[in-house]
Structures are given as structure tokens and as C-alpha cells.
Interface confidence: low
Amino acid sequence: GITIPRNPGCPNSEDKNFPRTVMVNLNIHNRNTNTNPKRSSDYYNRSTSPWNLHRNEDPERYPSVIWEAKCRHLGCINADGNVDYHMNSVPIQQEILVLRREPPHCPNSFRLEKILVSVGCTCVTPIVHHVA
Amino acid sequence: GITIPRNPGCPNSEDKNFPRTVMVNLNIHNRNTNTNPKRSSDYYNRSTSPWNLHRNEDPERYPSVIWEAKCRHLGCINADGNVDYHMNSVPIQQEILVLRREPPHCPNSFRLEKILVSVGCTCVTPIVHHVA
């Protein structure tokens, strides 16, 4: 890996669990300030593998609200607007990092957690298993 | 919002920036232990809007490696295996949280950052602008 010299201005850590426990500033820096929040808001409807967005809320997690995609159909929408079952709508999943309050209900102590979320759906050719 | 009583066993925070600066345990809890790591590994190839995955590495970020999807075609793959330009391949994007070392090169001090990543691609009907 790349070895980067330690910045002499770093905060000190006397924590016995260091480097597992770190200080995190929750004042979020958003690198997407110029992006349109509606940038892909209609893809869920215009896709050949459309999806619905479901709200998943958990006050013990940060961010507390996550939107989960659920594919509307097993098949994909064809040119006639009908569901074609020769193709499959499948969720595109991604592992994301969230902060989980630990111990529970603590405002200033968290643990990193990886969760799997469905972001949207795509249309794929099904895998056909030929019986010998 | 929901008011949750504070756990009396919470760590104390004397930090003047509290509650902006919190303690985070980086020993990740993975909620996806039963998921197949190859769960969508071939969707990028089987999709009617296939994509390539590009490695984005930044040692000052946690996680340091993020994979970005880039749609292979402008159009979508039709039943004959050709690109159909009457449809568009578009990236499905998601805002995710990462940790950015702050000050730079510090091993135990981070700031939360939101970044926009393309997770995969989906095939959509293009918006047709009719001229009056």
C-alpha cells in the first residue's frame, strides 16, 4: 500500500482500543453540491425494469432513513409496454457503510456497519440451465 | 422525531464540538454475512444495459477503494445482441457515506463525507421532446 507520513497536527488518541476507535466529525462534507437531487428521479418509472422505492427507517442508525428499491416485475417491460418473462428484472445491490449507535441510544458513540441495499433494477437475460 | 432516552452507560463527551464529533468503532459489523459475495457479479455483463466497473482508489478515504460503474453503450442491447439507440443505458447513482481523513494523513481522525457513485446501469425509454 501507499505509505503516507503522519500529519504532526493529528489529534492524539490515548484510547486503549486505538486504532479501532476514531474521532469522526459528523458535519458532513457533500462532494455533490452541484448535482441535481432529481438527477435520476424518473429512472425508476422509465426503466424497462421499473422499481418502487421503500423507506427504511431506523433511529439507531445514521443515516436513519435509507430508500430500498424493489423491482415491480419478475420480467422486463417490452416495446409494447407488456411484461416479457423471457427477461428478468433484478435488483442492483451495493454494500454501504452506516453508523450504528453503540451502546444503543447513545448520541455520541457509534460502530461502523456494512449493510446491503438495493439501489435500482436492471433487466438481464436469464441463465438457462439445460438438462442433459 | 422519535425521542429515545439516553443510555446511562454512554461514553462521556467533553468535546467542545459535541455532538458534531463522535467516537466510532471501525471494527465493522457486517450485516450481510449470509449474502453471496457473487450475488450480482454477472449482472454487469448479462444486463441489456451492460456496464464496466472502474476502480477508484483514495488512501485518504475509508473505504479506500470504491468501484464505479460506467455504462458500455449509449443504447441498450436488443434481442439480437445489437445496440438499440431507441433506448438509453443510464447509470443508477446513489449517495453514500465515506470517511475522509481530516486533517489529512491522520490515522484516527475523520470527517463524514457524502459522495455520488454509479452502482450499475438500467435501460430507460428516452424522453422525447416534441417541438410545438
Epitope: 448535482t35 | 445489437n82 439507440y85
Partner: antibody, heavy 115, light 107 residues
Framework: EVKLVESGGGLVRPGGTLKLSCAAS????????MSWGRQTPEKRLEWVAF???????YYPDSVKGRFTISRDNVRNILYLQMISLRSEDTAMYYC?????????WGQGTLVTVSA | DIQMTQSSSYLSVSLGGRVTITCKAS??????LAWYQQKPGNAPRLLIS???SLETGVPSRFSGSGSGKDYTLSITSLQTEDVATYYC?????????FGSGTKLEIK
Amino acid sequence: EVKLVESGGGLVRPGGTLKLSCAASGFTFSSFDMSWGRQTPEKRLEWVAFMSSGGSTYYPDSVKGRFTISRDNVRNILYLQMISLRSEDTAMYYCARGERYGSYWGQGTLVTVSA
Amino acid sequence: DIQMTQSSSYLSVSLGGRVTITCKASDHINNWLAWYQQKPGNAPRLLISGATSLETGVPSRFSGSGSGKDYTLSITSLQTEDVATYYCQQYWSTPFTFGSGTKLEIK
């Protein structure tokens, strides 16, 4: 070395026809999406046709129905058939490798539509 | 159609200086932007794709930045061979469109 050489340009009357060719070398032509772009005398750039490696085509409204892109994967040649030419089609025509943007361009062939 | 606006038609810069060329899209193009360099009598040459990715063989004094609607091409330590017209092009939404170009001159 990637090389694209256009030919077939010239002076043509409005309503006339012209067929441009682009000879490609230095890469596996059949594996790449190809495009035609043009640059007007006012130096304005515009894409006029795309063709995927699989043979599918796309045209902007300005040329749809008048221009046809095709390719010969054996001879490694990209074509642009232009009919019903108008004065506004006067431009330097370039062939380029790529579908969304031109990663490599030829030196161009000049098309002048004038009475 | 997405309009691409390059606000400066001409820029005059000293040799060795730094220049910034801007390009503004009429709608969000999510970094799907290319920059080209065109010298008199030559075809355009691709410098940057994906708003920031430098093409192979392009000197490191060229760099791209931006997001959303606003994008920038920067050239540090300007050389005589950088005298050219620079074009941006969006490839987010068909028809793909170019900016009108920014001509760079030496002071």
C-alpha cells in the same frame, strides 16, 4: 498506431448526394463503435451519425432520414451516405473512433453544398 | 437538447502562466464531459473524458474538474504548443453537443 483517413468530399449542388469513406487501420475495427462528426465554416462542431460495433445506428434530428452510416468490417471502412444535401451541411466531415466521444479523429474531408 | 456554453471565446495568457477554460451545461450532465484541443488545420484531439480523466499521452499540465452543470479545463505552465481552440462536449444526453470553443492565444 490508430489511423483514420476520410475521402469522398467535394462540391455538390443543394439536393445532391455524396458518399464519404473512412479507411481505418491500427486497431481491430470490427470491435469498435464509430462516428461521423462535422465542423462548419463557423467552427461549430456537431456529431451526425454513430454506429455500434454490432451495427446499430443513431442520428440526430438534423440529419435523420438524409444521412446513412454503414461499415464494412472486412475492408475496415466506415461510410456516410448523404442525400438531399442542404447549404447548412457545408462542413469538414470527420470520422472518429468512439460512440459517446471521439477518442481518435481522422484529418477530415471537406463537403461544400452550393448552387 | 443540452446547450454547452463556453463563456470566453478568446483567452490571452502569458507563457508559463495558468489558464482556466470554463464550460457550462444547460442541464446536469453528471461528469459525462469531454475536452478537445484543436490546432489550426488539424482535427480535434481528445484530452479528457469523464470530466477529469486524462487521455494517454496528454501532458499532466492539463487537468479537468467540475460536477453538475459546471466544468473547467485547467492548463498550468502554458507552453507555445498549447495555442489552440478548446472545445467541451457533453455525452450525457442525445444529441451530444459541443461548446462553441475557446481560442487560446499567447500574450
